[in-house]
């Protein structure tokens, strides 16, 4: 009679994690008499996953009914299977002995790969904000995923970039891996409305990468131009004044008017106007009575946006270039009186 | 191809610790026994211990006292600690890679590092 | 413990002559499976060991068809059927059956 042989079809298979893994075994032969044993791993250390004589595998099912008397498949069935089920399982058959079973031969076993999905990847940006111009960085990262292949892209606003840096972890084996990486962005005015893409690919995804994003209006600092304008007489005496506060993100900014370098008024912006871009517009004026004033009058617009330090333009109001009309009955008013922005 | 790297000091006190650590690269430290072996000057061989990449460990009855292997897959490391040492450990430990196949047995320690010498003396 | 006896402990040997080595081991290391688990190894002088033959008789990857080992149970030879110079060293025979693994004493092979 042929010797009986263990014959372990799959050389390798791969289940995603929470899945059944089927791991298929058949003898050639009813002889000898003896168990079964599922091992995982081989020599000294291996690890016993199931005895079809005794012992207790919540786990583990058999495919067959091994009470039949013909039978010879002794694959089994694992439930729930993690990263650290990986390894090499033999099915290996045991001759009937005395005291102790004595082991006969062994499957050529099968390697169990386990496929798990990566986290939605997080991106971060800078803990402060910066200006156009500055390079910034970003990173992104996930979790839990298995095997180590992975691939990692990043995007602008659909468009690819290039300036990264990714590390797997571990660099050994592990029941899975951790992606992070690093990408550098150049900062432009036009990117309150941009976002920042972090894509992730990988075996378990079928092709439909996870992404994560970051809008850049909570990284980006665009910094206000301002213009100080004199507009033409409002009426007898009075001069307006406007400050245009253009093109700056985010929206916190405070407003002060100076005379002569005194403090006038203080306001915080309110009632913006929103560009195309994502920046924003706002205007402060001043009525300026210039019959209270013999010299001629240094107007000072200062910001001081987002908390950065002030900035400011200035107006020089000539005295002078404002003769006073005549037989007129209006009373003079204050220096300067406050209005509403625009 | 595997390559596998001892570092650790080449001289220790007696009665203090040895510690040496074998790095792994070029492969996987899944599936094999991962050994420390020694080789007292003009002497033959003596294994001291190895641990599977489950993390079970064998160790030289001799030796079981004062000996504990432990493993890094993370870092694809593993390491050494032989504690109170004396004179006579002094040798070139070599780390090295055990295969097993199938059964209950090994089937040859196929990757060796290029040893490492360490001297026992005050 | 499984305790490995080679002999002889040192073989001039002449290259292109045969030559073999005998390791006796103090219990059987054929296993119930039918596998023998009787390792050869090769130290060359101020190198590592070389795995030469693993299972009895299955030669290494990479190492020369003249080295062949042959033997089963308690007694195992290895034989190189053409020395070349390149072959001197001291060679050992382990057991790897069970823990602790052991190793004979080892031959020392050189040229006469």
């Known amino acids: 009679e042929e010797e009986l042989q263990v014959i372990q079809p799959d050389k390798s298979i791969s289940v995603a994690a929470g899945e059944s893994a089927t791991l298929h075994c058949t003898v050639t032969s009813l002889i000898p008499v003896g168990p079964i044993q599922w091992f995982r791993g081989a020599g000294p250390g291996r690890e016993l996953i199931y005895n079809q004589k005794e012992g207790h595998f919540p786990r583990v099912t058999t495919v067959s009914d091994l009470t039949k008397r013909n039978n010879m498949d002794f694959s089994i069935r694992i439930s729930n299977i993690t990263p650290a089920d990986a390894g090499t399982y033999y099915c290996v058959k045991f001759r009937k002995g005395s005291p102790d079973d004595v082991e006969f031969k062994s499957g050529a076993g099968t390697e169990l790969s386990v496929r798990a999905k990566p986290s939605a990847p997080v991106v971060s940006g800078p803990a402060a904000r910066a200006t156009p111009q500055h390079t910034v960085s970003f990173t992104c990262e996930s979790h839990g995923f298995s095997p180590r292949d992975i691939t990692l892209k990043w995007f602008k606003n659909g468009n690819e970039l290039s300036d990264f840096q990714t590390n797997v972890d571990p660099a050994g084996d592990s029941v899975s891996y951790s992606i992070h990486s690093t990408a550098k962005v150049v900062l432009t005015r036009e990117d309150v409305h941009s976002q920042v893409i972090c894509e992730v690919a990988h075996v378990t995804l079928q092709g439909d990468p996870l992404r994560g994003t970051a809008n850049l209006s909570e990284t980006i600092r665009v910094p206000p131009t301002l213009e100080v304008t004199q507009q033409p007489v409002r009426a007898e005496n009075q001069v307006n004044v406007t400050c245009q506060v253009r093109k700056f993100y985010p929206q916190r900014l405070q407003l002060t008017w100076l005379e002569n370098g005194n403090v006038s008024r203080t306001e915080t912006a309110s009632t913006l106007t929103e560009n195309k871009d994502g920046t924003y517009n706002w205007m402060s004026w001043l009525l300026v009575n210039v019959s209270a004033h013999r010299d001629d009058v240094k107007l000072t617009c200062q910001v001081e946006h987002d908390g950065q330090p002030a900035v400011s333009k200035s107006h020089d109001l000539k005295v002078s270039a404002h003769p006073k009309e005549q037989g007129s009955n209006t009373a003079p008013g204050p220096a300067l009186a406050s209005a509403a922005p625009l | 191809q595997v390559q596998l790297q001892e570092s650790g000091p080449g001289l220790v006190k007696p009665s203090e610790t040895l510690s040496l650590t074998c790095t792994v690269s070029?492969?996987?430290?899944?599936?094999?026994?991962w050994s420390w072996i020694r080789q007292p000057p003009g002497k033959g061989l003596e294994w001291i211990g190895f641990?599977?990449?489950?993390?079970?460990?064998f160790y030289q009855s001799s030796l079981k006292s004062r000996v504990t292997i432990s493993l890094d897959t993370s870092k694809n490391q593993f390491s050494l600690k032989m504690t109170s040492v004396t004179a006579a450990d002094t040798a070139v430990y070599y780390c090295?890679?055990?295969?097993?196949?199938?059964?209950?047995?090994?089937?040859?320690?196929?990757?060796w590092g290029q040893g490492t010498t360490v001297t026992v003396s005050s | 413990d499984i305790v490995m006896t080679q002999s002889p402990l040192s073989l001039p040997v002449t290259p292109g002559e045969p030559a073999s080595i005998s390791c006796r081991s103090s219990q059987s290391l054929l296993y119930s499976t039918g596998y023998t688990y009787l390792d050869w190894y090769l130290q060359r002088p101020g190198q590592s060991p070389q795995l030469l033959i693993y299972?009895?008789?299955s030669r290494a990857s990479g190492v020369p068809d003249r080295f062949s080992g042959s033997g089963s149970g308690t007694d195992f030879t290895l034989k190189i059927s053409r020395v070349e110079a390149e072959d001197v060293g001291v060679f050992y025979c382990?057991?790897?059956?069970?823990?602790?693994?052991?190793f004979g004493q080892g031959t020392k092979v050189e040229i006469k």
């Open positions: 382990g057991q790897a059956l069970q823990t602790p693994l052991t």
């Open positions: 641990i599977y990449y489950n993390g079970r460990t």
């Open positions: 299972g009895g008789s």
């Open positions: 070029g492969g996987s430290i899944r599936d094999y026994y």
């Open positions: 090295a890679r055990v295969r097993a196949y199938s059964g209950i047995g090994l089937d040859g320690t196929d990757v």
